[in-house]
Amino acid sequence: LRLLDFPAPVCAQEGLSCRVKNSTCLDDSWIHPRNLTPSSPKDLQIQLHFAHTQQGDLFPVAHIEWTLQTDASILYLEGAELSVLQLNTNERLCVRFEFLSKLRHHHRRWRFTFSHFVVDPDQEYEVTVHHLPKPIPDGDPNHQSKNFLVPDCEHARMKVTTPCMSSGSLWDPNITVETLDTQHLRVDFTLWNESTHYQILLTSFPHMENHSCFEHMHHIPAPRPEEFHQRSNVTLTLRNLKGCCRHQVQIQPFFSSCLNDCLRHSATVSCPEMPDTPEPIPDYMPLWEPRSGSSDYKDDDDKGSSHHHHHH
């Protein structure tokens, strides 16, 4: 969690002198309670916005917006504390709006915004706006909280942010997976424009289960520049286990910007559909011989193997 370094945040508006200050998340009014405290914020809204840093990087930010209630407690409102809590790490970051002049009622409702909290892809936050001074112990709460889930890098706008691009979001491998026969799987994908290696992770599962029955990892060496953006294909040899028919193929790139933390892409091949009723056993001899070498009783220790090609 951090604050955007540019431009400087502003909370002043017509009819109000105000400055934004860093906060320890422990306002003085917690320690020295006041008798008269303002009511809570109204209509707190959190939206995903995007902002550029001074260096030109694009980051997702939490755009926080709220209004004031139209009651007399506006006369006792001295500011607001904005808090963002990252749920999985308990990390909290706060800023304080410090009002330097008294608020007065006027023809329009007071409305405040803040868009300087930088957030991470695929993370959940709890955003709280506390009006200041905070209430006395056992007093009515004068804060409003909302949860905010930041989309992952698959999201169209997130894809072009600096944190997502650093993890390889612009690469679309357009994976196709084809079952050649019971023992071979062909994987095709588009290479990115970087001379870096890739890893293909094959995990096979029985029809209706989530415990894998076969795993195989295949390394693809870094392509040459003339192969960038070309299709690459790999043929993977499957372990011939009966019922081990659902295959998940995951491609892991190792781009220089994200090393082993790059976004992975996957594709799945389902088991062939089983007929609802078993086929009747014919009462005649088939007119062809079964193909030799297609026994289901292959050695279980047979390791998966593979070969690959880059297409020019």
Partner: antibody
Framework: EVQLVESGGGLVQPGGSLRLSCAAS????????MNWVRQAPGKGLEWVSF????????YYADSVKGRFTISRDNAKNSLYLQMNSLRDEDTAVYYC???????????WGQGTTVTVSS | DIQMTQSPSSLSASVGDRVTITCRAS??????LAWYQQKPGKFPELLIY???TLQSGVPSRFSGSGSGTDFTLTISSLQPEDVATYYC?????????FGPGTKVDIK
């Protein structure tokens, strides 16, 4: 001293219910998310459930979803786990644990034992 | 859901040996990884968070490294009091899954 103390464990029949409690002291409980983690006899750690500081976000492991309910009472500095439709495989030591600022769980209770058996 | 695997499942080493335990996530989890030590009959204790940050009070012979999918816990010089089971845990998003554990004992 920062402390978590679990209670409420015991012997229960399959299909029965139990409510675990975790009493927190020595820190501002209302500012922290909390977790339940369990450990079956001779097995590894299994994360069970998470609740955020203001109860606005709750997560469960698939193995307990629909049967267990996590809750908290910040006024009483207490965390709870209501366990219904208990199964043999729910037999474990149940720990409540506080996440550290920055990640991981830095404060754990001593655990309470739940035995599901007929 | 992201799966966590650990290797080896158990190891025996001599006092003073350098011990390395690896943890692998089935998908990238950035540095949202913690390591715990659990001694027999005791509750787990946090050793390392954010993949490489040592928890206060933990001896400096423990260190963590890695990011993304591959993580390592290293004990630079194994001591008798380090006999325990070590677990990794991901906490980028729920479910906050633990690895299956690595049991460490002295030869």
């Amino acid at each position: 001293e920062v402390q978590l103390v679990e209670s409420g464990g015991g012997l229960v029949q399959p299909g029965g219910s139990l409510r675990l409690s975790c009493a927190a002291s020595g820190f501002t409980f209302s500012s922290y998310s909390m977790n339940w983690v369990r450990q079956a006899p001779g097995k590894g750690l299994e994360w069970v459930s998470f609740i955020s500081a203001r109860s606005s976000t709750i997560y469960y492991a698939d193995s307990v979803k629909g049967r267990f309910t996590i809750s908290r009472d910040n006024a009483k500095n207490s965390l709870y786990l209501q366990m219904n439709s208990l199964r043999d495989e729910d037999t474990a030591v149940y720990y409540c644990a506080r996440p550290k600022v920055g990640g991981g769980m830095d404060v754990w209770g001593q655990g309470t034992t739940v035995t599901v058996s007929s | 859901d992201i799966q966590m695997t650990q290797s080896p499942s158990s190891l025996s080493a001599s006092v003073g040996d350098r011990v390395t335990i690896t943890c692998r996530a089935s998908q990238g989890i950035s540095n949202y990884l913690a390591w715990y030590q659990q001694k027999p009959g005791k509750f787990p204790e946090l050793l390392i968070y954010a993949a490489s940050t040592l928890q206060s009070g933990v001896p400096s012979r423990f260190s963590g490294s890695g990011s993304g999918t591959d993580f390592t816990l290293t004990i630079s010089s194994l001591q008798p009091e380090d006999v325990a089971t070590y677990y990794c845990q991901k906490y980028n998003r729920a479910p906050f899954t633990f690895g299956p554990g690595t049991k460490v004992d002295i030869k």
